[in-house]
Amino acid sequence: KKVVLGKKGDTVELTCTASQKKSIQFHWKNSNQIKILGNQGSFLTKGPSKLNDRADSRRSLWDQGNFPLIIKNLKIEDSDTYICEVEDQKEEVQLLVFGLTANSDTHLLQGQSLTLTLESPPGSSPSVQCRSPRGKNIQGGKTLSVSQLELQDSGTWTCTVLQNQKKVEFKIDIVVLAFQKASSIVYKKEGEQVEFSFPLAFTVEKLTGSGELWWQAERASSSKSWITFDLKNKEVSVKRVTQDPKLQMGKKLPLHLTLPQALPQYAGSGNLTLALEAKTGKLHQEVNLVVMRATQLQKNLTCEVWGPTSPKLMLSLKLENKEAKVSKREKAVWVLNPEAGMWQCLLSDSGQVLLESNIKVLPTWSTPVQP
């Protein structure tokens, strides 16, 4: 007996071939001997089966001695043995229809779990193997679960159902809802405008929800809410914003915040949360602000940084085109009695400059100029 595997909702063609390459009488029945369809001369005739409106054949193939039964919009309950009667012989085909669905929505928040459930006909014992977009394989029986979804799990999951040495492949598109970056750092000189961007790693037609940016300034004992906003069909509207600092927010995606000026009291780290409509849980992105200030007070040239810096970052003071006068893994460095010229304060990581501030030291009789 020939075995054919089908997918729920799909179309399947069950073949039946006669030895004579011409149109002759045939009919298809199910295991209960109920006629599904057949021919009467050149006409297609249908029986009283439950497949009536979903069964078809191809007249053009009859002349080649092929008499297919085509079943559209397959259901699990279409799993049966189908019998083709042609030329006084019977061909049996066992059709097994499977369905694979994601238990929840296919749009899941980062960190959530994905459960895939296999629908199968009674008496079958299939095995399932799924491959994620990042190449991770998971195996199971009726259900497969993946916990702690990551951004790289977004995309097409390919699942293979095996039964009777035959296989059928399912493709399920999973969208992991997350920000493109889990964390970002912005380095700014004191007084500069600060741009924070929070691009999403997914696109959906309609995006509705609400969000908030909480900020923990390095100098503050507790965190505070800087801004709250709503998102409606990808349009952003601010609900509430602090007076200090007075953040501005872009009206369109990606989420975009502007801090008019970087000041030491704002240096620190923030957490932007986004709660999406009809989703439990929130999206998070951490953002950090590092602020640099270079000053000369009397005979002391000082460079300071505020905010979350890694211990391996180097802070240096150097006279332009000369070797660094001072270079330390600290958040403040200074030079006493600096010579006149353009001094550079540099914050660097393994030789790569992250932030630079220039200060002009004038001969001792005049006051310093900050460009």
Epitope: T11, E13, S42, D56, S60
Partner: antibody, heavy 115, light 107 residues
Framework: QVQLQQWGAGLLKPSETLSLTCAVY????????WSWIRQSPGKGLEWIGE???????NYNPSLKSRVTISVDTSKDQFSLKLSSVTAADTAVYYC?????????WGQGSLVTVSS | DIQMTQSPSSVSASVGDRVTITCRAS??????LAWYQQKPGKAPKLLIY???SFQSGVPSRFSGSGSGTDFTLTISSLQTDDFATYYC?????????FGQGTKLEIK
């Protein structure tokens, strides 16, 4: 709802090979036959041939010697190659889904053969 | 090959008119016939199959009839959206063949 999207070279020189591909989105690829049809002002609508998921083909005898239709089930795509083209092959080429009737069509690709 | 001949090749009519297009097969094709509507720059669209069955979404003013060699497509009350070219197609045997088309124009 099934959608067919097609693409390929639009301008050919005589004797070259026409090559078009059609991708099927949002519907069952199995169980159907996938056809190529062309439409020219001179000959109207002309069925070129078809293929199914298993790679079984049927061709129009008038074009059979020059036509190859192939399938890539991993991508739900099928392709048409028509060799040794002449000006008479200038037409709009459509891909379509069929059991007996062409119930879904691609957007069409204008192919011009000119020296 | 089965030849499909449509008549008339063009017809002028007004909104609200009843229009009939005929299609004749060079040999019997039972009811293995479909009708398509095509608008300029667009792909044909299936209207009627099995000679008289409606494709989903097709307005009920369209109807098909016939069997064997002679078939008709009738539009009971023309709407502005119906001005297009109509084709018949046989699915009885390879190669599938189409009629040459009937252009329905506004009078």
């Amino acid at each position: 709802q099934v959608q067919l999207q097609q693409w390929g070279a639009g301008l050919l020189k005589p004797s070259e090979t026409l090559s078009l591909t059609c991708a099927v989105y949002g519907g069952s690829f199995s169980g159907y036959y996938w056809s190529w049809i062309r439409q020219s002002p001179g000959k109207g609508l002309e069925w070129i041939g078809e293929i199914n998921q298993s790679g079984s083909t049927n061709y129009n005898p008038s074009l059979k010697s020059r036509v190859t239709i192939s399938v890539d089930t991993s991508k739900d795509q099928f392709s048409l190659k028509l060799s040794s083209v002449t000006a008479a092959d200038t037409a709009v080429y459509y891909c379509a889904r069929v059991i007996n009737w062409f119930d879904s069509w691609g957007q069409g690709s204008l192919v011009t053969v000119s020296s | 090959d089965i030849q499909m001949t449509q008549s008339p090749s063009s017809v002028s009519a007004s909104v609200g008119d009843r229009v009939t297009i005929t299609c004749r097969a060079s040999q019997g094709i039972s009811s293995w016939l479909a009708w398509y509507q095509q608008k300029p720059g667009k792909a044909p669209k299936l209207l009627i199959y099995d000679a008289s069955s409606f494709q989903s979404g097709v307005p009920s003013r369209f109807s098909g009839s016939g069997s064997g060699t002679d078939f008709t497509l009738t539009i009971s009350s023309l709407q502005t959206d119906d001005f297009a070219t109509y084709y018949c197609q046989q699915a009885n045997s390879f190669p599938y063949t189409f009629g040459q088309g009937t252009k329905l124009e506004i009078k």
